[in-house]
């Protein structure tokens, strides 16, 4: 679809005569008839196949024709066509004299013709005007012409319809050849597909408007390149969605079981050495001078009561020193210079001579001990605490500090390892002498029944088109991660590309 435009510029008829040579009375009131038709080697009368147009009276005898296009007038003359411009044409321009106001062909005498010109040739679509001048014996006509496309038509023949748009069926303007030129941020044959945020993962991300990156299920992050780990995964990571690969020192289905209590919590004090001994279990090996489960208690060397025979102990930086009572000597006041005559036995102890009176021995009443019955009985000397418990004197009584796994006054009771319900997924717990054992239900295995074995939603290969299947362990369902070009919960649908333009 386009328009053949003809701009009449000047008509010269100096003598004011008709084609017959007869003069016009009072002058030649001139109007034009234009016939546009298909190319003819010799232009002949017949239908104006491309269109016709007539002007009103434009002047008398000789005159210049005003350009009237801006005011909506009739110059240039418009000859619209609704077909592909063929590139060739024939043009007939007739100048007529109008004796009266009726310009219809049937109202004019046949000899009212002033002049007739006929041209033919090639003409390409374009904005440039072709200037021409045709002269006869009595007249001269200067004019220019061109062919332009109608609005929204493009191409060499004005055959391509293109309407710029910016809605969800396309975001584009039209190029001179009628092809689409996508607006920034859009792509695709019809410019309806947004260009996602730069770096947005091709398979795991998509967008509904430019510079956006929306993540498919199982993926997260600005570029949708980070997998979402299994729901509840505590100290673990993933390389594909719904995984939970435990960080070092952690175990269990959700990586929430601490296998390295020593590193994560540093429970041992005062430079003690920590050893992991199971889940949330550890043992501290104390440096000399320290005691307690966590080596938190400073151990005085006098606590072991090394001084005998009533000697008093004094702590020193490099050990201890015994101050012996009269009649005793030695590192621990273990040597006596006394005999029974010196009444050396305290607290009602009875003295017995030895070695012909050179030495003695005290027989102590209950609750007292020592070579001179000078000490109350240390209730811990008999090691009353079982299972490695530590005995602590507390005045007239004593108490046992038990190792993990034991309880009772003397640490004689084995704490049930099953009390913490360590068996996952409904496993049955059995106490053993040195730990516990889990009997797992169908579908689970491992020391704590934490490993899912038989139920695998991906086992049936539900995903199509080489998609990757992930089992969601919390729901026994699967998630398909589609390769580029496929969508759907099983990646069963190809993302169709629109076919080419229909023309």
């Amino acid at each position: 679809s386009g328009v053949f435009q003809l701009q009449l510029q000047e008509f010269i008829n100096e003598r004011g005569v008709l084609a017959s040579g007869r003069p016009c009375e009072p002058g030649c009131r001139t109007f034009f008839r234009v016939c546009l038709k298909h190319f003819q080697a010799v232009v002949s009368p017949g239908p104006c196949t491309f269109g016709t147009v007539s002007t009103p009276v434009l002047g008398t005898n000789s005159f210049a024709v005003r350009d009237d296009s801006s005011g909506g007038g009739r110059n240039p003359l418009q000859l619209p066509f609704n077909f592909t411009w063929p590139g060739t044409f024939s043009l007939i321009i007739e100048a007529w004299h109008a004796p009266g106001d009726d310009l219809r062909p049937e109202a004019l005498p046949p000899d009212a013709l002033i002049s007739k010109i006929a041209i033919q040739g090639s003409l390409a679509v374009g904005q440039n005007w072709l200037l021409d001048e045709q002269t006869s014996t009595l007249t001269r006509l200067r004019y220019s012409y061109r062919v332009i496309c109608s609005d929204n038509y493009y191409g060499d023949n004005c055959s391509r319809l293109c309407k710029k748009r910016n809605d969800h069926f396309g975001h584009y303007v039209c190029q001179p050849d009628g092809n689409l030129s996508c607006l920034p941020g859009w792509t695709g044959e019809y410019c309806q597909q947004p260009i996602c945020l730069s770096g947005c993962h091709e398979q795991n991300g998509y967008c509904s408007k430019p510079a956006e990156c929306l993540c498919r299920p199982g993926w997260q992050g600005r570029l949708c390149n980070e997998c979402i780990p299994h729901n509840g995964c505590r100290h673990g990571t993933c390389s594909t969605p719904w995984q939970c690969t435990c960080d070092e020192g952690w175990g269990g289905l959700f990586c929430d079981q601490d296998l390295n209590y020593c590193t994560h919590h540093s429970p041992c004090k005062n430079g003690a050495t920590c050893s992991n001994s199971g889940q949330r279990s550890y043992t501290c090996t104390c440096r000399p001078g320290y005691t307690g489960v966590d080596c938190e208690l400073e151990l005085s060397e006098c606590d072991s009561n090394p001084c005998r025979n009533g000697g008093s102990c004094k702590d020193q930086e490099d050990g201890y020193h015994c101050l012996c009572p009269p009649g005793y000597y030695g590192l621990h006041c273990e040597h006596s210079t006394l005999s029974c005559a010196d009444s050396p036995c305290f607290n009602g102890g009875s003295c017995r001579e030895r070695n012909q009176g050179a030495n003695y021995a005290c027989e102590c009443p209950p609750n007292f001990t020592g070579s001179n019955c000078e000490k109350k009985v240390d209730r811990c000397t008999s090691n009353p605490c079982a299972n490695g418990g530590q005995c602590l004197n507390r005045g007239p009584s004593r108490m046992c500090r038990c190792r993990p796994g034991f309880t009772g006054t003397y640490c004689e009771l084995h704490v049930s390892d099953c009390a913490r319900n360590p068996c996952a997924h409904g496993g049955t717990c059995h106490d053993l002498e040195n730990g516990l054992m889990c009997t797992c239900p169908a579908g689970f295995s491992g020391r704590r029944c934490e490993v899912r074995t038989s139920i695998d939603a991906c086992a049936s290969s539900p995903c199509f088109n080489r998609a990757t299947c992930y089992t969601d362990l919390s729901t026994d369902t699967f998630v398909c991660n589609c390769p580029y070009g496929f969508v759907g919960s099983r990646c069963e649908f190809p993302v169709g590309l629109p076919p080419s333009f229909p023309w």
């Epitope: 019809y190 597909q193 649908f493 190809p494």
Partner: antibody, heavy 121, light 106 residues
């Protein structure tokens, strides 16, 4: 041959939410060449475009209904749905679902047979 | 909001030409589709992209669009062409239908 089929209740009480589903067969709802639209026609009146959706979930609504309309898509079921809240008697109409073709510059080449929804107490 | 105006009714004798107009501001800059709807039936696309016919639509249906007016022409109208006809265009992201024209074949 692509076919569209509307389904949902034929009677809805005023102030409640109208819910309809369109099931697409014979073609994938996930094609990049199509939008999936809802159009309605009150008895004896003309067609009114309600809104449409792309398989990615992008939605476009008629401004006059936007505050009450929600259109969603379920690619796994090859379905898309319409919800219209706070309905009144003026929402009584035959509701059509249709396929809008990008290549046809938005022309709707396939339509459902329509379902009459009456709003009445 | 954008409006498309159609004459409520057009009457035509069998074999004659029926022309239905659809007017809207700068409508020639938009792509126009035309739908035929017979009583109790769903609409059928008869013209898209101003003048193109989907497969299966008879050649007697033609379309044009320029300026502010699009026209659907039914040449050699047949009794089976009696129906309501709707024009449709897109204004930004909104679909807009004309009010509809009832074509009666006398």
């Amino acid at each position: 041959e692509v076919q569209l089929q509307e389904s949902g209740p034929g009677l809805v009480k005023p102030s409640e939410t109208l819910s309809l589903t369109c099931t697409v067969s014979g073609g994938s709802i996930s094609s990049s060449s199509y939008y999936w639209g809802w159009i309605r026609q009150p008895p004896g009146k003309g067609l009114e475009w309600i809104g449409d959706i792309y398989y990615t979930g992008s939605t476009y609504y008629n401004p006059s209904l936007k505050s009450r309309v929600t259109i969603s898509v379920d690619t796994s079921k090859n379905q898309f749905s319409l919800k219209l809240s706070s309905v009144t008697a003026a929402d009584t109409a035959v509701y059509y679902c249709a396929r809008e073709d990008v290549i046809l510059r938005g022309g709707s080449d396939y339509w459902g047979q329509g379902t009459l929804v009456t709003v009445s107490s | 909001s954008y409006e498309l105006t159609q004459p409520p009714s057009v009457s035509v004798s069998p074999g004659q030409t029926a022309s239905i107009t659809c007017s809207g501001e700068r409508l020639g800059d938009k792509y126009v589709s035309w739908y035929q709807q017979k009583p109790g039936q769903s609409p059928v696309l008869v013209i898209y992209e101003d003048f193109k016919r989907p497969s299966g639509i008879p050649e007697r249906f033609s379309g044009s669009n320029s300026g502010d007016t699009a026209t659907l022409t039914i040449s050699g109208t047949q009794p089976m062409d009696e129906a309501d006809y709707y024009c449709q265009a897109w204004d930004r992201d909104t679909g807009v239908f004309g009010y509809g024209t009832k074509v009666t074949v006398l």
